[in-house]
Amino acid sequence: GITNINCSGHIWVEPATIFKMGMNISIYCQAAIKNCQPRKLHFYKNGIKERFQITRINKTTARLWYKNFLEPHASMYCTAECPKHFQETLICGKDISSGYPPDIPDEVTCVIYEYSGNMTCTWNAGKLTYIDTKYVVHVKSLETEEEQQYLTSSYINISTDSLQGGKKYLVWVQAANALGMEESKQLQIHLDDIVIPSAAVISRAETINATVPKTIIYWDSQTTIEKVSCEMRYKATTNQTWNVKEFDTNFTYVQQSEFYLEPNIKYVFQVRCQETGKRYWQPWSSLFFHKTPETVPQVTSKAFQHDTWNSGLTVASISTGHLTSDNRGDIG
């Protein structure tokens, strides 16, 4: 970068090289060029010469002033005009950054995805800081009082093998950058309470042509957790509102769920599960599309991701079982 150039002088920033966005800043340039008493001193920002707000302080020093500086990053350098030299002589350069101190991390969440071997901790970092911000995740055993710290730039995966201090822990997150430091509230966890079952997947659908046509959705999970509660949501692709069906599930065999749907309509299905009575849900599964036939039976197997599924329409749908209307997005 610009900071690696050979300097014939010195460039510095007040109040600092990294400063709060929107501040007034001064950039100083001091020449120390052999056989040259600078006639003029020039400043460049990102390669473009600045023409105004430059103050010559003395024979060798000038200052460039910026009001309300809002750029996250800029490369600054300054040059001198030496008598009888028509090319400007480079004095020095510096990369400057502006941003914000971190917000207090909130919504700290730690989960163990079944079979992952890791505890994954995430949090809401708050507003964008624009500058390098590091997070230290503190994990303290409530049984042994031993504390471990993990440095990261975003979320963290902690091997469950390293959690040797029993089952109960306090977790909190410290955010720090050049402009400040903040600490989250402490989250108390029990390792047995934060397991999310192995992903539930819809494998296929079929519509059986009976007196009243019936659609069967086949779905499964590799979980070994015995007591699992699941939700399946579905809607016509032209609608916005989801219908939700709830299940207490035993995954020793493939699940079959029955729906009584309108003929000749394209539907979308998703499923998610949690260990019964626990706090965290799986994310919703990939979108599974199924078009009901007009009369003839039809079997499909379409499970794929689609980015435009929630396109903002409403539904009226007929089904058996316990139904609720749902406008929720993906909740953890």
Epitope: Q37, R39, K40, R51, F52, Q53, I54, T55, R56, I57, N58, K59, T61, E81, P83, K84, F86
Partner: antibody, heavy 118, light 107 residues
Framework: EVKLVESGGGLVQPGSSMKLSCTAS????????MAWVRQVPEKGLEWVAN????????YYLDSLKSRFIISRDNAKNILYLQMSSLKSEDTATYYC???????????WGQGTTLTVSS | DIVLTQSHKFMSTSVGDRVSITCKAS??????VAWYQQKPGQSPKLLIY???TRHTGVPDRFTGSGSGTDFTLTISNVQSEDLADYFC?????????VGGGTKLEIK
């Protein structure tokens, strides 16, 4: 010997244009910034504009930059000031000055007088 | 724009005296200040640059001092030929500006 000789002054009507010239000798013209400074009779000096060695950089008094253009011809050792939409308040003696290596104006011409009147 | 104020429009002194002419800038100009002398019917001449450096050929009875916002031109052992207008100028920030001038009168 450093010598700066201004020319082109005279009486003009408001709204008209005029071009002042300054012929330099006794130094390497292209090595120096040059400037124009004006002085209303019995009043103070007012810096008007300056120009770098090759004419690629110019600066003006804010109130004049829409009407005045400073330029130079290094081959002929001449500095120019093109003035348009002249007003009575532009009436002054116009001095051409060399900006020394230390930035101050170290040599001045004898001045040329411009009178803007109807 | 930076305003340079020379508070005394006129100053009266006698031959052999010492006189100080002041110039105040509306904001910090470091040491980027020059002083000029303009005798009646003549063009200005540079006396001092960088606040305190005498130009070539300027008698050493002329001394400049100051930095930031307050500057002084001191003439010690005033001579009759020093009858003139004296101007300060800042070349710290564009547009360059000039003080209103101080006329030195010899009693």
């Amino acid at each position: 010997e450093v010598k700066l000789v201004e020319s082109g002054g005279g009486l003009v009507q408001p709204g008209s244009s005029m071009k002042l010239s300054c012929t330099a000798s006794g130094f390497t013209f292209s090595d120096y910034y040059m400037a124009w400074v004006r002085q209303v009779p019995e009043k103070g000096l007012e810096w008007v504009a300056n120009i770098n060695y090759d004419g690629s950089n110019t600066y003006y008094l804010d109130s004049l930059k829409s009407r005045f253009i400073i330029s130079r011809d290094n081959a002929k050792n001449i500095l120019y000031l093109q003035m348009s939409s002249l007003k009575s308040e532009d009436t002054a003696t116009y001095y051409c000055a060399r900006e020394g290596y230390d930035e101050a104006m170290d040599y001045w011409g004898q001045g040329t007088t411009l009178t803007v009147s109807s | 724009d930076i305003v340079l104020t020379q508070s005394h429009k006129f100053m009266s002194t006698s031959v052999g005296d010492r006189v100080s002419i002041t110039c105040k800038a509306s904001q910090d100009v470091g040491t980027a200040v020059a002083w000029y002398q303009q005798k009646p019917g003549q063009s200005p001449k540079l006396l001092i640059y960088w606040a305190s450096t005498r130009h070539t050929g300027v008698p050493d009875r002329f001394t400049g001092s100051g930095s930031g916002t307050d500057f002084t031109l001191t003439i010690s052992n005033v001579q009759s030929e020093d009858l003139a207008d004296y101007f300060c100028q800042q070349y710290s920030t564009y547009p360059y500006t000039v003080g209103g001038g101080t006329k030195l009168e010899i009693k």
